[in-house]
């Protein structure tokens, strides 16, 4: 099991909507999900 990842579903976890107050910020990095670096967290 890929223990270098925080969650076991790192490969399928979808992006989540950012909170309303952050939605118009310039940082488009997903808050969760497989968009995090492949090297793990």
């Amino acid at each position: 099991q890929a223990t270098e990842y925080e969650y076991l579903d790192y490969d399928f976890l979808p992006e989540t909507e950012p909170p309303e107050m952050l939605r118009n910020s310039t940082d488009t990095t997903p808050l969760t999900g497989p968009g995090t670096p492949e090297s793990g967290k």
């Epitope: 099991q1 969650y7 076991l8 579903d9 790192y10 490969d11 399928f12 976890l13 979808p14 992006e15 999900g33 497989p34 968009g35 995090t36 670096p37 492949e38 090297s39």
Partner: antibody
């Protein structure tokens, strides 16, 4: 918007190999795992494996290890799956998928 | 491999009423981190699968809140309140606890 474009169909002879493509657009291709899933006619979904475009790191379903080879071309944001030694059992729809986004699937027909 | 079991067909439902679809796993999908790694997908006729629910009860982006997921470690239910015509299709559960990722055989939602 996120799009995963796959050819609609491929017709291949038994014993041959085929390389299926999946062109990604609308997101950073190198940041997300790409999955491949098989669906035989009228059947359920079977996970083949996945690849991370940034590193080329792969994870295969043991059942498909000798059948499928996953690769990517970062320059064209395209994922590939090569299937070898094809038989009628390989006739199916093959989907590429990025968690909440799936391609339309390629219908592979293996027939002489 | 973890085996996911689903009935092939749902009990026929009338439009506007609620429907429930069940799924069972051969191993508990509730991890020590408190997360239940159970996903639901819908495949409408002639379309690709789409993610509905992740981690047993979380609604994927763009999915109507008529859909909800619940369950224990091994027994899961997808509930659709106020079924609409567009909900027709095959519903698949899948486990994301272990590799290989495995899907249930799918349950076809039947309309009366």
């Amino acid at each position: 918007q996120v799009q995963l474009q796959q050819p609609g169909a491929e017709l291949v002879k038994p014993g041959a190999s085929v390389k299926l493509s999946c062109k990604a657009s609308g997101y950073t291709f190198t940041s997300y795992w790409m999955h491949w899933v098989k669906q035989r006619p009228g059947q359920g979904l079977e996970w083949i494996g996945m690849i991370h475009p940034n590193s080329g790191r792969t994870n295969y379903n043991e059942k498909f290890k000798s059948k499928a080879t996953l690769t990517v071309d970062k320059s064209s944001s395209t994922a590939y799956m090569q299937l070898s030694s094809l038989t009628s059992e390989d006739s199916a729809v093959y989907y590429c998928a990025r968690s909440d986004y799936w391609g339309q699937g390629t219908t592979l027909t293996v027939s002489s | 491999d973890i085996v996911m079991t689903q009935a092939a067909f749902s009990n026929p439902v009338t439009l506007g009423t609620s429907a429930s679809i069940s799924c069972r796993s051969s191993k508990s999908l509730l991890h020590s981190d408190g997360i239940t790694y159970l996903y639901w997908f819908l495949q409408r006729p002639g379309q690709s699968p789409q993610l509905l629910i992740y981690r047993m009860s979380n609604l994927a982006s763009g999915v109507p809140d008529r859909f909800s997921g619940s369950g224990s470690g091994t027994d899961f239910t997808l509930r659709i309140s106020r079924v609409e015509a567009e909900d027709v299709g095959v519903y698949y559960c899948a486990q994301m606890l272990e590799f290989p990722r495995t899907f249930g055989g799918g349950t076809k939602l039947e309309i009366k």
